[in-house]
Interface confidence: low
């Protein structure tokens, strides 16, 4: 019997996710694969030899190799999941625990600027715990969460790139910024 620490797994809100069982090979000796959602100690899916596969609702799908698919992730799918595998003699041969964490995907960051005081802003509207990074002509300038404001002085024309990312997604925007000598908005 093998009990491991929880495997941290990240899923994107609204997307599907597969909880794959590492180092497990399905064989004729396997009689029972049972998935539980531990917050309510409820069985959510189960494979039994010579029996119909059980699933608590249609958002769950259990594959022959023991992988659990959760469809269209919702915030309340964030939970600790446990899979227990038994052989034909009733012996618990494997147990794995998955700590499923869910994030909203980041949206494409928006770059805006004003030539009056050569100030540029990059902001991201959507996404859980976004990390913003701002680059000027390929050089990293700043890191922040939702908004970056930057005053540039090196030249009136530059190419700015802003990237937003989290554990489940990454988006970027590139804007060539050009200001006249006088500094008009």
């Amino acid at each position: 019997k093998e009990i491991t620490n929880a495997l941290e797994t990240w899923g994107a809100l609204g997307q599907d996710i597969n909880l794959d069982i590492p180092s497990f090979q399905m064989s004729d000796d396997i009689d029972d694969i049972k998935w539980e959602k531990t917050s309510d100690k409820k069985k959510i899916a189960q494979f039994r030899k010579e029996k119909e596969t059980f699933k608590e609702k249609d958002t769950y799908k259990l594959f022959k190799n023991g992988t659990l698919k959760i469809k269209h992730l919702k915030t309340d799918d964030q939970d600790i999941y446990k899979v227990s595998i038994y052989d034909t003699k009733g012996k618990n041969v494997l147990e794995k625990i998955f700590d499923l964490k869910i994030q909203e995907r980041v949206s494409k960051p928006k770059i805006s600027w004003t030539c009056i005081n050569t100030t540029l802003t990059c902001e991201v509207m959507n996404g859980t715990d976004p990390e913003l990074n701002l680059y000027q002509d390929g050089k990293h300038l700043k890191l922040s969460q939702r908004v970056i404001t930057h005053k540039w002085t090196t030249s009136l024309s530059a190419k700015f790139k802003c990237t937003a990312g989290n554990k489940v997604s990454k988006e970027s925007s590139v804007e060539p910024v050009s200001c006249p000598e006088k500094g008009l908005d």
Epitope: S107, K108, K110, I111, S112, T121, E123, M125, S173, E175
Partner: nanobody
């Protein structure tokens, strides 16, 4: 999903006026920046004007002649075009993007686009 519908295009003589309308549906209108862009045959799409909840911006070529405004109750943005010139002839597009108040001038910064309305200025 945000949908945009332009109207008000047409033909007018130089010096004349037109008012374009852009009706936005599908999202909380007041949270969006709405811009007008135009594209003449064989040319790139260019910025005309934009409006957010807190400000407006215009291309130098239309400043003093065009006025952008919005009616949040009707989910509509208007572009009042006065003293029209032949070089204003183009297909005019409205576009929308979420904004906390910044005015965006680049087409790449807009997520949603209308189908366009033709404006022809000719004697």
């Amino acid at each position: 999903q945000v949908q945009l519908q332009e109207s008000g295009g047409g033909s007018v003589q130089p010096g004349g006026s037109l008012r374009l309308s852009c009706t936005v549906s599908g999202r909380t209108f007041s949270n969006y920046a709405v811009g007008w862009f135009r594209q003449a045959p064989g040319k790139e799409r260019e910025f005309v004007a934009t409006i957010t909840g807190s400000g407006t911006a215009y291309a130098d070529s239309v400043k003093g002649r065009f006025t952008i405004s919005r009616d949040n109750a009707k989910n509509t943005v208007y572009l009042q075009m006065n003293s029209l010139k032949p070089e204003d002839t183009a297909v005019y597009y409205c576009a929308a993007t979420w904004s906390s108040g910044y005015t965006f001038r680049s087409p790449t910064q807009y997520d949603y686009w209308g189908q366009g309305t033709q404006v022809t200025v000719s004697s």
